[in-house]
Interface confidence: low
Amino acid sequence: DAHKSEVAHRFKDLGEENFKALVLIAFAQYLQQCPFEDHVKLVNEVTEFAKTCVADESAENCDKSLHTLFGDKLCTVATLRETYGEMADCCAKQEPERNECFLQHKDDNPNLPRLVRPEVDVMCTAFHDNEETFLKKYLYEIARRHPYFYAPELLFFAKRYKAAFTECCQAADKAACLLPKLDELRDEGKASSAKQRLKCASLQKFGERAFKAWAVARLSQRFPKAEFAEVSKLVTDLTKVHTECCHGDLLECADDRADLAKYICENQDSISSKLKECCEKPLLEKSHCIAEVENDEMPADLPSLAADFVESKDVCKNYAEAKDVFLGMFLYEYARRHPDYSVVLLLRLAKTYETTLEKCCAAADPHECYAKVFDEFKPLVEEPQNLIKQNCELFEQLGEYKFQNALLVRYTKKVPQVSTPTLVEVSRNLGKVGSKCCKHPEAKRMPCAEDYLSVVLNQLCVLHEKTPVSDRVTKCCTESLVNRRPCFSALEVDETYVPKEFNAETFTFHADICTLSEKERQIKKQTALVELVKHKPKATKEQLKAVMDDFAAFVEKCCKADDKETCFAEEGKKLVAASQAALGL
């Protein structure tokens, strides 16, 4: 439905508070280096303009597209060239090229200082002094560090952030109340950001059809009682929502997401029996709840898949008439029967089925040719099952920290050219699959583990894309979205890698390590482990374990010493010498 003024339409649909919050998120995700105050000023100017359009949709400039209005506003920033360099060239372009240009300059790893959490009393004072500014600052800081964060979901996080401060700043023990809530929000926020980043990468790097296929599989698992037409409608709408958010169209995205939640709740009888509680919640909670809702029970009387997709004489006819619809139906039918499979496995099966039909429908006897197609699925199903079984056994044997270390060594040997911070971050996250998924029963392990690994490996892909250093990473990241994990799993030690020169400075530690949190201390040790492997890629597990055990003992000893700094200096030299000898450096 055409509106005379798009900005007025969205302002009225979303309300002033959400409008302002979403424009702030959009601007912070585009101009990630701009100070908070500059963004607030721009948002206020846009909001005042939107109000004039609400009052009179025919007023000057009110008929302009949101991209034009927002892009014009961003291009008024005085320091654009100095702060952003070539991004300033975007402003010489016309829409839609200008917006595409801004999108291409989004930085997944912006050079911003780490967010340091102030004392609880300081935070509570700031919250009470100016609640609105405090919450806006939260949106701004998250959005600029996570330029693809799912904007309507960030509003949900901000609501929970506000609730935490409202409750805990009145509590007897503010810190005990607040800190666990903030930790939970931080961890959930990082996970949410990474999941959305994969959705955007799917859309932007592999196209709408790739995202739709993913959505068909996931929604069919979640809503196995819904008919194919219903799932198709939801997939189409969900694709529109995520295309908009990934494209920076945050007002449209939030509006359409609200419409989708409304539709799902109005039609829950034909979608899922698990939606009742979600649909009683307010909008932000409702949308979040629907996105996380558990899988509905599978219908009891589902017939064998073979009848329609192998035994039927019409397989090639149905396939030829509408290939992607037929494959979509195959994916829907397979996925609703297999909540125990990962989405990426389901997509591999669909791809195999498609390849078989492509070959067989051109053969002399098509039916004879594709009759055994389901047998081809067996190795594809067993590969992730075996991998998860082996890794969960290793995790249970080692615990999370040492399991992460095993993965650090494994991945550094596979792709040693990747930067040490990226290897540490990615391997730590890969290692979290153990505590996240291995506790689940067999039927839930694969969807938990392999789909989580897809999210983490996408982090590696987007970070590597910014500064590509490894052809092997590029190959695994770009060749096939659904085969990324098997591609990385299949990589062996990179025999072409020339070991890094030994640099004693890399292994010099100071007393400041003693005051770090356990997590930060682990990261320091894991950074050293990656560097060790880069120096000595042929080192055995036993050699590396011995050096790491010595290192842990050295840190513990020096942190207990009276003169910590001297201990670190003297014992550190000994440790480096002993390690060099042990590893033959």
Epitope: P96, E100, F206, A210, A213, W214, L481
Partner: nanobody, 127 residues
Framework: HVQLVESGGGLVQAGGSLRLSCAAS????????MGWFRQPPGKEREFVAA????????FYRDSVKGRFTISRDNAKNTVYLQMNSLKSEDTAVYFC????????????????????WGQGTQVTVSS
Amino acid sequence: HVQLVESGGGLVQAGGSLRLSCAASGRTLSSYDMGWFRQPPGKEREFVAAITRHDFNTFYRDSVKGRFTISRDNAKNTVYLQMNSLKSEDTAVYFCAARLDPIFASNSEYAPLYDYWGQGTQVTVSS
């Protein structure tokens, strides 16, 4: 979105050669699988050739194999179709098409799976 513009068509004698170009604007072509299709007079549109985005693998319809060559120059944002030993049955409007890598459709020949199309360029081979 990507916009595609074909050029290089024209009238040529049987046995002659033409080189069609397809220039893209709006987005870099390196993200796309590219294909050439054609529509002979009074007939359905048909696949001619395709080239993948990753490894530059090429595919051809049987009747043009050995005569036509598809290539791409990502730096110039252009895809080419070199047509040699042209025959009268090659007469058609030639269309350039681009597709983001779909999860399905490994078959490059399936026109509905291409996302973007040019307006076409006429090739007439006279005998």
